[in-house]
Interface confidence: medium
């Protein structure tokens, strides 16, 4: 029956949840009501084989390999561990046990398309005119922001921030072509009076 020592399901009157021979209407924690009596739930990692009777304990069996149950339960079938499909960009982050599911995450450079991580997509690149505000993680995409006046980005990148326009003045040059959100300013020599 694989019970924890501290959770024995002794079949005494107290355990039946009623008094004076009356059938119980509610059961204690980690028990369930069936056929007017309280039976022990199966512990995490085990499934129900048969309900208890007046004379027998609840019968539970451990989940098989690649299966799990993560709660005290009366399930007759264990859940299959999640499959981290590499074709969907997934890899195993944490191997499942009889009590926990497998946790999938994305390959490097990818992120989950939902918190449940059922598939992955490549990190988004920020288009020219936009810079990276926040670099992507395994669970969140790149966050882009428009380059403000005085800044530009001329590449599509998942890492590059907006760069400030070149300061022509510090090079003793003047602006020959104004900058945009996608292009730097073009500096040139000052026209000298002849």
């Amino acid at each position: 029956d694989y019970k924890d020592d501290d959770d024995k399901d002794y079949k005494d009157d107290d355990d039946k949840g009623g008094s004076g021979g009356e059938p119980p209407t509610a059961c204690r924690e980690k028990q369930y009501l069936i056929n007017s009596q309280c039976c022990s739930l199966c512990q995490p990692g085990q499934k129900l084989v048969s309900d208890c009777t007046e004379f027998t304990e609840t019968e539970c069996l451990p989940c098989g390999e690649s299966e799990f149950l993560d709660t005290w339960n009366r399930e007759t079938h264990c859940h299959q561990h999640k499959y981290c499909d590499p074709n969907l960009g997934l890899r195993v982050q944490q191997k499942g046990t009889s009590e926990t599911d497998t946790i999938c995450t994305c390959e490097e450079g990818w992120h989950c398309t939902s918190e449940a991580c059922e598939s992955c997509v490549l990190h988004r690149s920020c288009s020219p005119g936009f810079g990276v505000k926040q670099i992507a993680t395994g669970v969140s995409d790149t966050i882009c922001e428009p380059c403000p006046v005085g800044f530009f980005s001329n590449v599509s990148s998942a890492f590059e921030k907006c760069h400030p326009w070149t300061s022509c003045e510090t090079k003793d040059l003047v602006v020959q072509q104004a900058g945009t959100n996608k292009t730097d300013v073009v500096c040139g020599p000052q026209d000298r009076l002849r």
């Epitope: 993560d70 709660t71 399930e75 859940h79 299959q80 999640k82 499909d85 590499p86 074709n87 969907l88 960009g89 398309t113 939902s114 918190e115 449940a116 059922e118 598939s119 992955c120 997509v121 490549l122 988004r124 995409d141």
Partner: antibody, heavy 117, light 106 residues
Framework: EVQLQQSGPELVKPGASMKISCKAS????????MNWVKQSHGKNLEWIGL????????TYNQKFKGKATLTVDKSSSTAYMELLSLTSEDSAVYYC??????????WGQGTSVTVSS | QIVLTQSPAIMSSSPGEKVTMTCSAS?????IHWYQQKSGTSPKRWIY???KLASGVPARFSGSGSGTSYSLTINSVEAEDAATYYC?????????FGGGTKLEIK
Amino acid sequence: EVQLQQSGPELVKPGASMKISCKASGYSITGYTMNWVKQSHGKNLEWIGLINTYTGGTTYNQKFKGKATLTVDKSSSTAYMELLSLTSEDSAVYYCAGTGTGAMDYWGQGTSVTVSS
Amino acid sequence: QIVLTQSPAIMSSSPGEKVTMTCSASSSVSYIHWYQQKSGTSPKRWIYDTSKLASGVPARFSGSGSGTSYSLTINSVEAEDAATYYCQQWRTNPYTFGGGTKLEIK
């Protein structure tokens, strides 16, 4: 603005096959996983499968294996679903839906398929 | 497969009332997503990852829940909220939808 534009309604004969297209605009199709969903009688929604639009990897609902085939053409930003050996049970509206932030974020307008002789 | 049971199937409400619809999963799921569908149109993402409102969704909507029990609440219902609302899970393939709750406004 992100949009998924699906191909028009289809009237097909039993036993025939057909292909529905779903063209993405306003974003790169590879930025989303593409799902396909069937809606029968304007009510029940059923998930058919999904395709990773970058790798082409697919996952199907067991019920639709052999019935639906999902593909993607990255160059045209278009996802496709081919429906095989059609019967009257396949008459429904089919949607493509892109997943990017935890749910089916963007939906196509739907393609109505009627199977009738 | 995980079965999602929505209740009630149909509900009627008057403007200004508080409305709650539920989605019960046959086994535990991590997140539930909600979609709104109006007659003749595509479903729209409405609430994702149990409680996050999609862009453009009014603040009168909220989502909550965990394990096998989830709900969508509208604090003060308005005429434009008349629609069918579907819940959906990503926990186990096949990724399933509930049967929908049709909200009618009197």
